[in-house]
């Protein structure tokens, strides 16, 4: 899977879209999870309604919402009041029994609010590395990782 980058401004809302084949994933609930480390598990943040027919209903977990257009094949996640700690690697998933298929890998970047003159030192941007290869560009305040970028901040 390529990783698509979605950029949002701190304090504002960011909408992430994950297109999928609605016929292939018929009847399947979806989920949004956060990747813990480069090879770690993906921790569930929020999932769609327990009844697939009601997947269009927005479900919230804290400041994160999820809604699914099951016929059109688009899963939409909204991150409200985006904060620096929201930056990182996520996945859109299609759930099937105990399995989860990855629909899209998403890197969320948090940009400093241009109107906020406080120290932006705690905002994280991906650093340079030669290890990350999957890259393609897709805009809507989003892009894909450039070759050489890594989805996790370097650890000291």
């Amino acid at each position: 899977h390529n990783t698509t980058v979605f950029q949002g401004v701190a304090g504002q809302s960011l909408q992430v879209s994950c297109p999928y084949d609605s016929m292939k994933h018929w009847g399947r609930r979806k989920a949004w999870c956060r990747q813990l480390g480069e090879k770690g598990p993906c921790q569930r943040v929020v999932s769609t309604h327990n009844l697939w027919l009601l997947s269009f209903l927005r479900r919230w977990n804290g400041s994160t919402a999820i809604t699914d257009d099951t016929l059109g094949g688009t899963l939409t996640i909204t991150l409200r009041n985006l904060q620096p700690h929201d930056a990182g690697l996520y996945q859109c998933q299609s759930l099937h029994g105990s399995e989860a298929d990855t629909l899209r890998k998403v890197l969320v970047e948090v940009l400093a609010d241009p109107l906020d003159h406080r120290d932006a030192g705690d905002l994280w941007f991906p650093g340079e590395s030669e290890s990350f290869e999957d890259a393609h560009v897709e805009h809507s305040i989003s892009r894909s990782l450039l070759e050489g970028e890594i989805p996790f901040p370097p650890t000291s």
Epitope: D21, K24, W26, G27, R28, W52, L53, S98, E99
Partner: antibody, heavy 122, light 107 residues
């Protein structure tokens, strides 16, 4: 008419390879999962695996993983089940079936092929 | 994988009698269960999906019930053409396993 038509009966020797087919018609072949089911003589149904012809995503039952290969050619609306080295224990009737979608979100094998009898004997 | 156990293995009944077939799952499959009928020399035919919904063209004498781990297929009054083997199958998770089957034979 929506249907799945399978290739004819096969008689093979142990160690030989084989590829049987299942051709779909009357519906959008790329938009439905196609499964394969084994039925050994006088026995029950065994779910072997499934393929989504739209992108060739394939899942196998652990019992059949590595024993068979499921593939599809969407340009001719055909799914395949193949063996690289047959064994006498592969003697069985093999069915392909379409995984139909239900309004509730569930799925079920709603259209079945007529079956392909494979006999492996020295 | 989810194991489906069908009982009884064989059911000997007369035409007009009521048939009750059971299918038990090793773990919950919610209502993601289907029933199929297979007659000798024929491919299986879908009877019931979603545990209780009749497939297109299936007579009303066939009904399904249950959810979670215990399911039942009932044939209210057996017709001569109903004597066959019946299989349950779960589509809750891969692999979509089948039960071992119940043969409904003429007494």
């Amino acid at each position: 008419e929506v249907q799945l038509v399978q290739s004819g009966a096969e008689v093979k020797k142990p160690g030989e390879s084989l590829k049987i087919s299942c051709k779909g018609s009357g519906y959008s072949f790329t938009s439905y999962w196609i499964g394969w089911v084994r039925q050994m003589p006088g026995k029950g149904l065994e779910w072997m695996g499934i393929i989504y012809p739209g992108d060739s995503d394939t899942r196998y039952s652990p019992s059949f993983q590595g024993q068979v290969t499921i593939s599809a050619d969407k340009s001719i609306s055909t799914a395949y089940l193949q063996w690289s080295s047959l064994k006498a224990s592969d003697t069985a009737m093999y069915y392909c079936a379409r995984l139909g979608r239900k309004p509730s979100g569930s799925v079920a094998f709603d259209i079945w092929g007529q079956g392909t009898m494979v006999t492996v004997s020295s | 994988e989810i194991v489906l156990t069908q009982s009884p293995a064989t059911l000997s009944l007369s035409p007009g009698e009521r048939a009750t077939l059971s299918c038990r799952a090793s773990q919950s499959v919610s209502s993601y269960l289907a029933w199929y009928q297979q007659k000798p020399g024929q491919a299986p035919r879908l009877l019931i999906y979603d545990a209780s919904n009749r497939a297109t063209g299936i007579p009303a004498r066939f009904s399904g019930s249950g959810s979670g781990t215990d399911f039942t297929l009932t044939i209210s009054s057996l017709e001569p053409e109903d004597f066959a083997v019946y299989y349950c199958q779960q589509d809750y998770s891969w692999p979509y396993t089948f039960g071992g089957g119940t043969k409904v034979e003429i007494k």
